[in-house]
């Protein structure tokens, strides 16, 4: 195919996105970013909420938007599930809110394919444990 | 409660060094980007320094690179600016302050005036 | 490097007036923009973020706007405690924060 050197995959190296169940990306990412560095420095602003511990499915997510998977199969990166997406902000949404911030419009559900099938290719992600919120009295954001 | 307290300014001669420390409760600075921003009399805000403790990055303006060094120290929840080097124009009021969400700084210490004069 | 460009440098105001500042980004710096409020002898506070964002707790006659590279702060209808210095802050370049010179509202 013509177009062989542009759909090349490249390695994912943003060292929280390794060993997620896929290992190499096409950038430009979902929300835009060129460079997996740029991609790298925005993630690392939701630590916090990672570390909080709001949804298991949270660092899948992010990196599957900031580090699209990508195939050799098809030329486009292939991003979250909606359903994922309205799991993870269900979860972490109310925890965000604690810290005094909204859910990021680049992280939008209605951004996502509703589920994966062969006109939308998108990630179902590893399945959410459908148990309680940390309990923390009171809660407080950040604080480990 | 999440607080940021700075410590360490005074008055130094030109040419000399001076250690600033940010000291933080209520929160783990290693998930956090931790910055430096002066103010000098009159004058508005300036961006000085970043660090992103739990991989080390550290970012710096123009004007103080090479003469001051961002640092962190996890085990005691502080940051420290190192500031050497120093010029009549670097005296002001420095802040810490912390950002995570949309680079927000959402909380900053209530500063510690630095006065660089013979 | 990027430069925030504020306007007025200062403004006098009246209470209950509406009341616009704006910074002009001297390239394209997304919605990554932050306003903060500053009085004298005191710690800058977080007003706005992600340039429309209303930070927790602000009062919401504080809102912010964006056309292009134009980001607008404004509040609705001033309170005596809004006499104070605003400044503009860019982040798109997650290592360059970059301010802007600010604008302080006086009593008129």
């Known amino acids: 195919f013509g177009d062989e050197e542009e759909r090349r995959c490249d390695p994912i190296r943003i060292s929280m996105c390794q060993n997620l169940g896929y290992n190499v990306t096409k950038m430009p990412n979902l929300v835009g970013h060129e460079l997996q560095t740029d991609a790298e420095l925005q993630l690392t602003t939701f630590t916090p909420l990672i570390q909080y511990g709001c949804s298991s499915q949270l660092q899948f997510f992010l990196c599957s938007v900031y580090v699209p998977m990508c195939t050799e199969k098809i030329n486009i990166p292939i991003g979250p599930c909606g359903g994922m997406c309205l799991s993870v902000k269900r979860r972490c949404e109310p925890v965000l809110k604690e810290f005094g911030f909204a859910w990021p419009e680049s992280l939008n559900c209605s951004k996502f394919p509703p589920q994966n099938d062969h006109n939308h290719m998108c990630m179902e992600g590893p399945g959410d444990e459908e148990v309680p919120l940390p309990h923390k009295t009171p809660i407080q954001p950040g604080e480990e | 409660e999440v607080q940021l307290v700075e410590s360490g300014g005074g008055l130094v001669q030109p040419g000399g060094s001076l250690r600033l420390s940010c000291a933080a409760s209520?929160?783990?600075?290693?998930?956090?980007?931790i910055h430096w921003v002066r103010q000098a009399p009159g004058k508005g805000l300036e961006w000085v320094a970043s660090?992103?403790?739990?991989?080390?990055?550290?970012y710096y303006a123009d004007s103080v690179k090479g003469r001051f060094t961002i640092s962190a120290d996890t085990s005691k929840n502080t940051a420290y600016l190192q500031m050497n080097s120093l010029r009549a124009e670097d005296t002001a009021v420095y802040y810490c302050?912390?950002?995570?969400?949309?680079?927000?700084?959402?909380?900053w210490g209530q500063g510690t005036l630095v006065t660089v004069s013979s | 490097d990027i430069q925030m460009t504020q306007s007025p440098s200062s403004l006098s105001a009246s209470v209950g007036d509406r009341v616009t500042i704006t910074c002009r980004a001297s390239?394209?710096?997304?919605?990554?923009v932050a306003w903060y409020q500053q009085k004298p002898g005191k710690a800058p506070k977080l007003l706005i973020y992600?340039?429309?964002s209303l930070y927790s707790g602000v009062p919401s006659r504080f809102s912010g706007s964006r056309s292009g590279t134009d980001f607008t702060l404004t509040i609705s209808s001033l309170q005596p405690e809004d006499f104070a210095t605003y400044y503009c802050?860019?982040?798109?370049?997650?290592?360059?924060?970059?301010f802007g010179q600010g604008t302080k509202v006086e009593i008129k």
């Open positions: 660090i992103y403790p739990s991989s080390g990055y550290t």
């Open positions: 992600s340039a429309s």
């Open positions: 302050a912390r950002s995570s969400f949309y680079w927000a700084m959402d909380y």
């Open positions: 209520g929160f783990n600075i290693s998930y956090y980007y």
């Open positions: 390239q394209s710096v997304s919605s990554a």
């Open positions: 802050q860019q982040s798109y370049a997650a290592y360059l924060f970059t």
